[in-house]
């Protein structure tokens, strides 16, 4: 749908020229749909640029869905002929570095920079501890490293590619991207709850994974980490479906899904299995 | 010289709507983050919101949360305010500032007043 | 939210004469990354706010250097050494370190 065309912005390999219109949907986030089988698919993960295994729930979801880990290697990552890895001198920026700063849809808010495709600078921005994108360094000194021309118009360091020999792919050497998920769910939802370094006392939730349920706290309004949700349902939704459950016998069933996009604060968009 | 004039204040009720903006000039303004902060009748400064540099992505102050949207068109050198569900406390002096690469306001416009009351 | 706290909120001062301004947090302002994006912002009299120092201490282009910015982690302090009658008006305290943003209450600086 449109929502979902807007949504993504193409991120391909650091050495090649963008992917082209049809294969655009290799860099759609994995959407596992409104229903509730479990279904083994595979998608393509930009983050690390691999094909990836995911429970698809068997209805609705994207194009960046494989029967098998081949279709989607086919689909998604080019042969090893066909790459140009050029030497240091020569490198280009990865096409990361153009994006807009994303501070993705949670609100655990940390000093971040990214690369400003205008001013040609690295700049901070506050990312919310969840999504985003890979303009999106820990550091200055990253950011510059990998985004920054260097005084001959050149890149300042090496920007290093590493080929996967399990599927082909290029895998970026020198970024950070922001760790965003581990398991079969975001990593965050593995996190204790953090009251953070302020004096209000604000209702939140977080997803406990030891006893597997979302579980009230206190928040001090500042600080902290991103297991923090203002209501139960938030949190069941983002933490929740990432642990497999079993379901009942039955067909499949549907739920409503709230769509809120680009608005920072309000994390209503959902947090899928494995890596956006 | 780095120029914001922000337009667009005036009376309205309770609960209407008011759509401020904020001509920039003197810079590249697709280059910087914007934000919009609000002065109170007598009072101190409030942040309201910011959005990004391409005007994909928004944060915004509890306060205004679910009422406010803040938008931009880089191509007219422009920052907007749509303001919804106003109330009696969002009675206020609306400025529009720039964002610098630290992520601090550097340069802040002249002001318009919103004044909220039936 | 990160509050802050600003002493006095009203400083007569004799033209020539020093004056200081106190601003607290509470927590740190210490970032992630080493810096302390604590601000001081000048508003004179029916004008809108103009920035002064940034990071502690950094002068905006064009502030005169009679004005001096200190401090670390939460204790802050803005000097001015010599007050001039342009010097008139509320002086804010905020800070960009967490999100979201806030500002101190404002010290209204008055010739006596």
């Known amino acids: 749908d449109s929502e979902e065309d807007e949504e993504h912005t193409i991120i391909t390999d650091t050495e090649l020229p963008p992917l082209k219109l049809m294969h655009s949907f290799c860099a759609f986030k994995a959407d596992d749909g409104p229903c509730k089988a479990i279904m083994k698919r595979f998608f393509f993960n930009i983050f690390t640029r691999q094909c990836e295994e995911f429970i698809y729930g068997g209805c609705e979801g994207n194009q960046n869905r494989f029967e098998s880990l081949e279709e989607c290697k086919k689909m998604c990552t080019r042969d090893n002929a066909n790459r140009i890895i050029k030497t240091t001198l020569q490198q280009e920026k990865p096409d990361f570095c153009f994006l807009e700063e994303d501070p993705g849809i949670c609100r655990g808010y940390i000093t971040r920079y990214f690369y400003n495709n205008q001013t040609k600078q690295c700049e901070r921005f506050k990312y919310g501890g969840c999504l985003g994108n890979m303009n999106n360094f820990e550091t200055l000194e990253e950011c510059k490293n990998i985004c920054e021309d260097g005084p001959n118009g050149f890149q300042v360091d090496n920007y290093g590619t590493q080929l996967n020999a399990v599927n082909n792919s290029l895998t970026p050497q020198s970024t950070k991207v922001p760790s965003l998920f581990e398991f079969h769910g975001p990593s965050w939802c593995l996190t204790p709850a953090d009251r953070g370094l302020c004096r209000a006392n604000e209702n939140r939730f977080y997803y406990n994974s030891v006893i597997g349920k979302c579980r009230p706290f206190k928040y001090s309004g500042c600080g902290g980490n991103e297991n923090n949700f203002t209501s139960k349902q938030e949190c069941l939704r983002a933490c929740k479906k990432g642990f497999i459950q079993r379901i009942s016998k039955g067909g499949l069933i549907k739920t409503k899904r709230k769509r809120k996009k680009q608005r920072v604060k309000i994390a209503y968009e959902e947090i899928f299995v494995k890596n956006m | 010289e780095v120029q914001l004039v922000e337009s667009g204040g005036g009376l309205v009720k309770p609960g209407g709507s008011l759509r401020l903006s904020c001509a920039a000039s003197?810079?590249?303004?697709?280059?910087?983050?914007m934000n919009w902060v609000r002065q109170a009748p007598g009072k101190g400064l409030e942040w309201v919101g910011t959005?990004?540099?391409?005007?994909?992505?928004?944060y915004y102050a509890d306060s205004v949360d679910g009422r406010f949207t803040i938008s931009r068109d880089n191509a007219k050198n422009s920052l907007y305010l749509q303001m919804n569900s106003l109330r009696a406390e969002d009675t206020a002096v609306y400025y529009c500032?720039?964002?610098?690469?630290?992520?601090?306001?550097?340069?802040w416009g002249q002001g318009t007043l919103v004044t909220v009351s039936s | 939210d990160v509050v802050m706290t600003q002493t006095p909120l009203s400083l007569p001062v004799t033209l020539g004469q020093p004056a200081s301004i106190s601003c607290k947090s509470s927590?740190?302002?210490?970032?992630?990354?080493?810096?302390?994006?604590l601000n001081w912002l000048q508003q004179r009299p029916g004008q809108s706010p103009k920035r002064l120092i940034y990071?502690?201490?950094k002068l905006d282009s064009g502030v005169p250097d009679r004005f001096t910015g200190s401090g670390s982690g939460t204790d802050f302090t803005l000097k001015i050494s010599r007050v001039e009658a342009e010097d008139v008006g509320v002086y804010y305290c905020?800070?960009?370190?967490?999100?979201?943003?806030?500002f101190g209450q404002g010290t209204k600086v008055e010739i006596k």
């Open positions: 500032a720039r964002q610098d690469g630290n992520f601090l306001m550097d340069y």
């Open positions: 990071l502690v201490s």
């Open positions: 959005i990004t540099t391409g005007g994909s992505y928004t």
């Open positions: 927590p740190s302002l210490l970032d992630v990354d080493g810096k302390t994006y």
């Open positions: 905020w800070q960009g370190t967490h999100f979201p943003f806030t």
């Open positions: 003197g810079f590249t303004f697709s280059s910087y983050a």
